[in-house]
């Protein structure tokens, strides 16, 4: 018998990218970050 | 919510063509990993599946009836349709159609099926 | 094709009691890509048939927990903990790993 069609088997977890920007006062600039998951990776 | 309603002749003679149409809300056809089948009972008997269709026209039959059967979609419509031909008295049954997912979120099994629709075939 | 023999193909119960329906496939139904399509689907009187667990052992959405289902290879269980009286009907197992996607037979639930 021939297969039906499924997924690879894989569950993908969505996760949300959050980007942001923190001001640390006028004479330091900015902090740009890259949030995955809760955890800041860039 | 998903809903799903199926609809067809009623009754028809034996030879002729039976066409079935299954409109169905609350999901789209242009999603990716979605797709309609179709599941026949008689009266007093079990299930027997015979198709199904996915987003990307994808089709699958039930090979002992492939011969005579033909699925296909109106995604705008949100409609799959079921063309059995020459059909016989045998055919009579209750014709459900169901959703079924590709993917995780959608479940991958038939998660919602319509109310079903009566056809007997008569001479 | 695959064919789904379910056991017993009727059962009563008293209302409380467990519930246990067997159904067995021909050949394994493991797909290829590592999930077993092992469907339990409840048709009530008059009704289409609604999921109840699908991949063996996941429950769908609003599913009571005295729901269950269990197995491998060819050799699927489910089981009701307590039997109520919105449960009665005809329970199904089906297999969507392989064309053609197959039903068992039924089983009866029904009161003693």
């Known amino acids: 018998d021939a297969e039906f069609r499924h997924d690879s088997g894989y569950e993908v977890h969505h996760q949300k990218l959050v980007f942001f920007a923190e001001d640390v006062g006028s004479n330091k600039g900015a902090i740009i970050g890259l949030m995955v998951g809760g955890v800041v990776i860039a | 919510q998903v809903t799903l309603k199926e609809s067809g002749p009623g009754i028809l003679k034996p030879s002729q063509t039976l066409s079935l149409t299954c409109s169905f809300s609350g999901f789209s056809l242009s999603t990716a990993g979605m797709g309609v089948g179709w599941i026949r009972q008689p009266s007093g008997k079990g299930l027997e599946w015979l198709a199904h269709i996915w987003w990307d026209d994808d089709k699958y039959y039930n090979p002992s009836l492939k011969s005579q059967l033909t699925i296909s979609k109106d995604t705008s419509r949100n409609q799959v349709f079921l063309k059995i031909t020459s059909v016989d008295t045998a055919d009579t049954a209750t014709y459900y159609c169901?959703?079924?997912?590709?993917?995780?979120?959608?479940?991958?099994?038939?998660?919602?099926w319509g109310q079903g629709t009566s056809v007997t075939v008569s001479s | 094709d695959v064919l789904m023999t379910q056991t017993p193909l009727s059962l009563p119960v008293s209302l409380g009691d467990q519930a246990s329906i067997s159904c067995r496939s021909s050949?394994?139904?493991?797909?290829?890509?590592?999930?077993?399509?092992l469907e339990w689907y409840l048709q009530k009187p008059g009704q289409s048939p609604k999921l109840l667990i699908y991949k063996v052992s996941t429950r769908f959405s609003g599913v009571p927990d005295r729901f269950s289902g269990s197995g491998s290879g060819t050799d699927f269980t489910l089981k009701i903990s307590r039997v109520e009286a919105e449960d009665l009907g005809v329970y199904y197992c089906?297999?969507?790993?392989?064309?053609?996607?197959?039903f068992g037979a039924g089983t009866k639930l029904e009161l003693k």
């Open positions: 050949q394994s139904i493991v797909h290829s890509n590592g999930n077993t399509y």
């Open positions: 089906f297999q969507g790993s392989r064309v053609p996607l197959t």
């Open positions: 169901a959703r079924r997912g590709l993917y995780y979120g959608n479940y991958d099994a038939m998660d919602y």
